[in-house]
């Protein structure tokens, strides 16, 4: 039961996390104009990974996409890449984890296969979460650096021709969404990896509790399972008695570590 719960919860948490990563990546408010001592502004600037926007107090909002690739800062490109990699890995992880869920039966898929798939998806979620956290953190660091640079130099000139008030930018909502989403995906991935340990058939367990008789060796497991004779390659562990009603969690082809606890 605990394995399914852990796996299911890991899947749900990761799903929410990846949805959050996608949302954060698409959001326009990665950086927002710092209002410092002026809470009401006539022109409010905010920027995302893909476009920058201006909201006027008239209610008019104008967004312009970054229609150049080469002209963009390398850091922004790196953040974009990290977020996309995070989304792609997360999406693949979700796809894999759906088939790995214990509550979903697909043909005669062995628990060992499900355990491997659970571990794979867990690792994918962990990497996905780390990519998102890294991406958001790189962007945040870029903002902090630029913030102090623009504070030191509130006015900037462009070749002496155009004078513009330096707009200072601070953390936008997307950064917090990204951090939380990345964290959730990471937690979900860890939970999937923990669930995998509960699903995986590990023969070392039998060795740890085996008793060697003079004629042949038999490994006993508490809980109504008897391992095959000897330590060769067991193809099936036969259930010799049914100890009453069991939940779906307990109906397993292979014993798991969870059963030893």
């Amino acid at each position: 039961m605990a394995v399914t719960a852990c796996q299911g919860l890991g899947f749900v948490v990761s799903l929410i996390g990846i949805a959050g990563i996608i949302a954060a990546t698409c959001m326009d408010q990665w950086s927002t104009q710092d209002l410092y001592n002026n809470p009401v502004t006539a022109v409010f600037n905010y920027q995302g990974l893909w476009r920058s926007c201006v909201r006027e107090s008239s209610g008019f909002t104008e967004c312009r996409g970054y229609f150049t690739l080469l002209g963009l800062p390398a850091m922004l490109q790196a953040v974009r890449a990290l977020m996309i990699v995070g989304i792609v890995l997360g999406a693949i992880g979700l796809l894999v984890s759906i088939f790995a869920l214990k509550c979903i039966r697909i043909g005669s898929m062995e628990d060992s296969a499900k355990a491997n798939m659970t571990l794979t998806s867990g690792i994918m979620f962990i990497v996905s979460g780390l990519c998102a956290i890294a991406g958001v953190s790189v962007f945040a660091n870029m903002l902090v650096t630029n913030f102090w640079m623009s504070t030191a130099n509130m006015y900037t000139g462009m070749g002496g021709m155009v004078q513009t008030v330096q707009t200072r930018y601070t953390f936008g909502a997307a950064l917090f969404v990204g951090w939380v989403a990345g964290g959730l995906t990471l937690i979900g991935g860890v939970m999937m990896c923990i669930a995998c340990r509960g699903l995986a058939p590990e023969e070392t367990n039998y060795k740890a509790v085996s008793y060697h008789a003079s004629g042949h060796s038999v490994a006993y497991k508490p809980g109504g399972f008897k391992a095959s004779t000897g330590f060769g390659s067991n193809t099936k562990n036969k259930k010799i008695y049914d100890g009453g009603a069991r939940t779906e969690d307990e109906v397993q082809s292979y014993p798991s570590k969870h059963d030893y606890v």
């Epitope: 022109v43 600037n45 920058s52 209610g59 004078q163 513009t164 008030v165």
Partner: antibody, heavy 115, light 113 residues
Framework: EVQLVESGGGLVQPGGSLRLSCAVS?????MNWVRQAPGKGLEWVAW????????TYADDFKGRFTISRDDSKNTLYLQMNSLRAEDTAVYYC???????????WGQGTLVTVSS | DIQMTQSPSSLSASVGDRVTITCKSS????????????LTWYQQKPGKAPKLLIY???TLVSGVPSRFSGSGSGTDYTLTISSLQPEDFATYYC?????????FGQGTKVEIK
């Protein structure tokens, strides 16, 4: 088509109060009050977001003037307290448009502060 | 607060003349977010409410004759009437639309010579 009609102007004694109204029809996201003293230039008074109620004032009017709106009546107000002789002006309500420009203006209402 | 200074305060011109009014702001009105200058021009005739002519320094309002044009960036802006018409004799105001409080220039009165 946006239409703005001001009312509530008149003669008031120094130190007195007056509430100006601006009946609004058509789409107005945010509104302003602008005044013009006789023979003088335009002076911006206050701004309000008609949806959120967010507002801001020119420094000279903070504390004395209050901009507000009534959603049910689709009306904009300017409550003026502690009026002084220098507040004598024609008061206009105006809609804020693209580029934070004032595209639609009311006909104006004259406020005279005199003893 | 941003101060707006218009020049000249008044000018006399004849029909068909090219008229230029300048407006200087104490701070830049150019927004780095969209590279637009938040400066607006109005025309006001005696006893009437002001009429919007130009916003974003150079965007002409629909219905306004093309003889009106706006230019400038940063702190220096210009309103040009290419060929003055009888109905253009009025007072012209520039306005800071970049930050609260919105501020107006003192006005330029265009009179018949």
């Amino acid at each position: 088509e946006v239409q703005l009609v001001e009312s509530g102007g008149g003669l008031v004694q120094p130190g007195g109060s007056l509430r100006l109204s601006c009946a609004v029809s058509g789409y107005t996201f945010s509104m302003n009050w602008v005044r013009q003293a006789p023979g003088k230039g335009l002076e911006w008074v206050a701004w309000i977001n008609m949806y959120t109620g967010e507002k801001t004032y020119a420094d000279d009017f903070k504390g004395r003037f209050t901009i507000s709106r009534d959603d049910s009546k689709n009306t904009l107000y300017l409550q003026m307290n502690s009026l002084r002789a220098e507040d004598t002006a024609v008061y206009y309500c105006a809609r804020l448009y693209n580029g934070n420009s004032l595209d639609y203006w009311g006909q104006g209402t004259l406020v005279t502060v005199s003893s | 607060d941003i101060q707006m200074t218009q020049s000249p305060s008044s000018l006399s011109a004849s029909v068909g003349d090219r008229v230029t009014i300048t407006c200087k702001s104490s701070q830049s009105l150019l927004n780095s977010g969209n590279w637009k200058s938040y400066l607006t021009w109005y025309q006001q005739k005696p006893g009437k409410a002001p009429k919007l002519l130009i916003y974003w320094a150079s965007t002409l309002v629909s219905g306004v004759p093309s003889r009106f044009s706006g230019s400038g960036s940063g702190t220096d802006y210009t309103l040009t009437i290419s060929s003055l018409q009888p109905e253009d004799f009025a007072t012209y105001y520039c306005q800071n639309a970049y930050s609260f409080p919105f501020t107006f220039g003192q006005g330029t009165k265009v009179e018949i010579k």
